[in-house]
């Protein structure tokens, strides 16, 4: 069967019907359907006016305008808001009421596209394998990235989050039109990786998506990741404005000037330094989502009531931090180079600026505890990777899972750890699953380009597609049309259960309490350390006129939820203020070159997981780790849960102005609507209340935006805002 021309709100579209094998199955593929009008720089996306006749949707459109990997030119286009659809078809009737999976690509909110890298004439984000193996509709799309997607003045002049609004427009378009392609508009699953995983998370938390999303999967990135929220957007806006010759004294004049500046100039005005970094890469990515008081009405930690009815899978790769650690400390991948205690201490201190000397020493001691018994270079290098994995990915993901679970009503929560080792032959043997290594398996590359892979890779890919698509169908990764290797139990605050995804899976793949000691350290011990003053915490910013962008100031509130710590029955305590931090790491779409498989298979190279031609650019923002409840001005640590205590502890309130509210389970009060004033972030009910989602506070044309304190511009960012 085949669809032929499909009528959408824009008009008729015609794709291509691709036959699969001899049994009569096929897939209808539509590439390049506009879901919004051509963009205007630094403005919200607008509906597409439509077309007459039948649109031939047979080729991918250009990606959104972005810098090349060398950052000396641009590619892509301003006219970029297009989506792609894969619809599996059987022999007889056209498909009806299929589950829909919408992919959001990663790339540090800086790069990427809906189709991804092209390798062996096969695009990374080609939805065909998922669609045909899982019998689901797959949708991918482009959204604006970099300054054009995320530049913000922190107020109504340039509220920011244009890229997030593009994503929302695509989701809403799918909701309105997918029935015509055979999809079920009431069964939409978002999935994404890295910045895409964080975007998935943010979309579930935004009140704009109420009723649009049924399920969600975040791979290696959540809204609470320290690189996701920019707390000082004005700092970065001014940097770009200075570069392109716009006035910086008055935000309104600066905004007007930026809007009429050549978009290519805006894009190239921002460069992420890739070598010789004085601080961890995380410090340098400036253009990421902001709390705008409207699309993201409050700190994400306070918005989990909005996701109470959305089934959720979140997980990380066991060495997600490897690519970033190897950029921050190149010795990691070099057998002839050593990692010293001094090297690691320096790295740790750069991630723990706000806690000063005590933060650096305590963190260093916790992570180097094993070095006495095993001083080998392999162990030391693994420690560095574990440290960045924990801070950038694992701990924030654990907190997000705990928050989702604590707020969920009927919704289910599942956690995973992807551990199938990287195929990069240039990496040391001890390297596990690096950042973005999971993408190729989710998208079925071992089947699409089989010569680049081994049977065990196909086993992993088959399992992931089965779990992911079963989940999209039913909300339970075990139930659906696809057989799975073992039962995946839901995550609960009591068991902290997670599925370890490897080439051999059985009942022992279901594990509990991942890295509990380190999770406890970040959310309890580290949190309790006093925050040092600006002066004590401020390393000297980069000087000279190098391309290295100076590090922006940090926000002034340290907050975040306490996840369950393994043996406590107490639900996590949501924090109350800025969870906050910087941007996102590349994500699979950023572009490592193709790599030949290792071993003696003689097989051709493994498709790259990126799409630009160099190792992915890690995140860089101003925070480097998962958020944690504020410690207050008193320095008194929050009382940790004791295991069998009744209500969870309430940490001190810090300087955010609003005390955190622990989940109560039976609150009927509606969430507080944010006012746009960052001093009082709204705290939604976190239990199983029937409370409505937190609504936006204004119209999207002039969203209230929390003010940014521009007075601390010389200050370095706090990397870990726990």
């Amino acid at each position: 069967a085949k669809l032929g021309a499909v009528y959408t709100e824009g008009g008729f579209v015609e794709g291509v019907n691709k036959k699969l094998g001899l049994l009569g199955d096929s897939v209808d593929i539509f590439k390049g359907i506009p879901f919004a009008a051509p963009t205007k720089a630094l403005e919200n996306p607008q509906p597409h006016p439509g077309w007459q006749g039948t649109l031939k949707a047979k080729n991918f459109k250009k990606r959104c305008l972005q810098a090349t990997i060398t950052q000396d030119s641009t590619y892509g286009d301003e006219d970029c808001l297009y989506l792609n659809i894969w619809v599996p078809q059987g022999r007889k009737q056209v498909s009806r009421d299929l589950p829909v999976m919408i992919w959001i690509y990663g790339g540090a909110f800086l790069m990427g596209s809906g189709h991804g890298a092209n390798f062996l004439n096969n695009y990374l984000y080609d939805g065909e394998e998922i669609a045909t193996r899982g019998n689901v509709i797959v949708v991918t799309f482009n959204y604006r990235v970099g300054p054009l997607g995320f530049l913000s003045t922190g107020d109504a002049n340039l509220p920011g989050n244009y890229g997030l609004r593009d994503q929302h427009m695509a989701i809403a378009w799918v909701k309105r039109n997918i029935a015509a392609f055979g999809g079920d508009p009431n069964n939409i699953t978002l999935f994404g990786e890295s910045a895409g995983g964080a975007s998935v998370s943010l979309q579930t938390l935004s009140p704009y998506n109420k009723g649009l999303i049924r399920r969600a999967i975040s791979q290696s990135g959540v809204a609470l990741s320290p690189w996701v929220i920019q707390k000082n957007p004005l700092f970065w806006a001014k940097k770009v404005a200075e570069k392109v010759g716009c006035p910086v004294g008055d935000a309104a004049r600066m905004a007007q000037c930026l809007k009429v500046t050549d978009p290519r100039a805006l894009t190239l005005a921002y460069k992420v330094p890739l070598a010789g970094l004085e601080y961890p890469m995380l410090h340098y990515v400036g253009f990421v989502p902001v709390i705008d008081g409207d699309f993201i009405p409050a700190d994400p930690i306070n918005l989990y009531a909005n996701a109470a009815d959305i089934d959720y899978i979140a997980g990380t790769n066991n060495m997600d931090g490897h690519i970033f650690a190897s950029i921050d400390m190149p010795a990691i991948n070099k057998g002839n180079k050593k990692v010293t205690e001094e090297d690691f201490y320096k790295l740790v201190s750069e991630f723990t600026i706000t806690k000063g000397l005590r933060g650096a020493k305590t963190t260093f001691d916790v992570y180097t505890e094993s070095w006495a018994q095993d001083p080998s270079q392999e162990n030391k290098k693994k420690t560095v990777v574990d440290f960045e994995t924990d801070v950038l990915f694992l701990v924030p993901t654990e907190i997000a899972l705990a928050q989702h679970r604590a707020n969920a009503k009927s919704a289910k929560t599942y956690a995973y750890l992807f551990s199938h080792p990287s195929r990069m032959p240039v990496y040391p043997k001890w390297v596990g699953a690096d950042h973005a290594d999971d993408i190729q398996y989710v998208f079925g590359k071992p089947f699409a380009t089989p010569t680049g892979y081994r049977p065990q890779d196909r086993t992993v890919s088959k399992a992931m597609i089965a779990y992911w698509t079963n989940f999209a169908k039913t909300g339970d990764p075990n139930m659906g049309d696809s057989a799975v290797p073992t039962h995946w139990e839901p995550y609960t605050t009591e068991n902290s259960g997670y599925l370890e995804i490897t080439k051999k899976m059985g009942s022992s793949s279901m594990k509990r309490s991942l890295r509990t000691n380190f999770l406890r350290y970040w959310t309890l011990t580290y949190l309790a350390l006093p925050t040092v003053t600006d002066q004590e915490a401020t390393p000297v910013p980069p000087t000279g006129d190098s391309e290295a962008t100076p590090v922006p100031p940090t926000g002034d509130s340290e907050t975040a939820p306490v996840p369950p710590t393994g043996d406590s029955g107490a639900p996590p305590v949501p924090p109350t203020g800025d969870s906050g931090a910087p941007p996102v790491p590349p994500t699979g779409d950023s572009g490592a070159p193709p790599v030949p498989p290792t071993g003696d298979s003689g097989a051709p190279p493994v498709p790259p997981t990126g799409d630009s031609g160099a190792p992915p650019v890690p995140p860089t923002g101003d925070s480097g780790a998962p958020p944690v409840p504020p410690t207050g001005d008193s320095g008194a640590p929050p009382v940790p849960p004791t295991g069998d205590a009744g209500p969870p502890p309430v940490p001190p309130t810090g300087d955010s102005g609003a005390p955190p509210v622990p989940p109560t389970g039976d609150s009927g009060a509606p969430p507080v609507t944010p006012t746009g004033d960052s001093e009082t972030a709204p705290v939604p009910p976190t239990g199983d209340s029937g409370a409505p989602p937190v609504p936006p506070t204004g119209d999207s044309e002039a969203a209230p935006v929390p003010p940014t304190d521009d007075s601390k511009e010389a200050q370095m960012p706090a990397v870990i805002r726990f």
Epitope: E9, F12, P47, P49, G50, W51, G53, T54, A172, K175
Partner: antibody, heavy 119, light 105 residues
């Protein structure tokens, strides 16, 4: 100027079929989609479906799927809407309506054709 | 399908009055169109793309809204404005509101 002229009123028995025509003039016939909308006596407007006169592509509302067929004749700049297995509830005024621009609203309407289904 | 709820279903007003008709869509939509229909006549396009006035339509008619809530406003009713008004959305399966009959008080 744009004109859409529809065929005259019809009286049909239940189970029969009816074919209503809509002749277009004053613009390039193949350049704009043509929709069919009906209105039962004293009721609101109901979308039936759409045809692209350029290539003949059609899309029908779920409710009418299997019962409605839209065709066009480019030589006479005419579109047709045939509704089969008629029942009394199909008694209505049937309108053809042309897109105004892009995919947007229905900017030009025919005068309507009353179809009465009665035994 | 997208559900459209138009209110009120009928309305009595006098010449010179300001009148507002609302239409709520679920889920949210891109654009709303508004039509006027007089007895025995075909509908006539008034407002398209939410707020754009069709040529030849008097400026006392205006449209606004976004997402789920849309409004048609007649700033000062004239005798010829007494008619039935319909909202209309374009998705892959277009739908109309139930109509608002505007009568002379």
């Amino acid at each position: 100027q744009v004109q859409l002229v529809q065929s005259g009123a019809e009286v049909k028995k239940p189970g029969a079929s009816v074919k209503v025509s809509c002749k277009a003039s004053g613009y390039t016939f193949t350049s704009y989609n043509m929709h069919w909308v009906r209105q039962a006596p004293g009721q609101g407007l109901e979308w039936i479906g759409v045809i692209n006169p350029g290539d003949g592509a059609t899309s029908y509302a779920q409710k009418f799927q299997g019962r409605v067929t839209m065709t066009r004749d480019t030589s006479t700049s005419t579109v047709y809407m045939e509704l089969s297995s008629l029942r009394s509830e199909d008694t209505a005024v049937y309108y053809c309506a042309r897109d105004y621009y892009g995919s947007s609203p229905l900017g030009y309407w025919g005068q309507g054709t009353l179809v009465t289904v009665s035994s | 399908d997208i559900q459209m709820t138009q209110s009120p279903s009928s309305l009595s007003a006098s010449v010179g009055d300001r009148v507002t008709i609302t239409c709520r869509a679920s889920p949210s939509i891109s654009y709303m169109n508004w039509y006027q229909q007089k007895p025995g006549k075909a509908p006539k396009l008034l407002i398209y793309a939410t707020s754009r006035l069709q040529s030849g339509v008097p400026s006392r008619f205006s449209g606004s809204g976004s997402g789920t809530d849309f409004t048609l406003t007649i700033s000062s009713l004239q005798p010829e404005d007494f008619a039935t008004y319909y909202c209309h959305q374009r998705s892959s399966s277009p739908t109309f509101g139930q109509g608002t009959k505007l009568e002379i008080k």
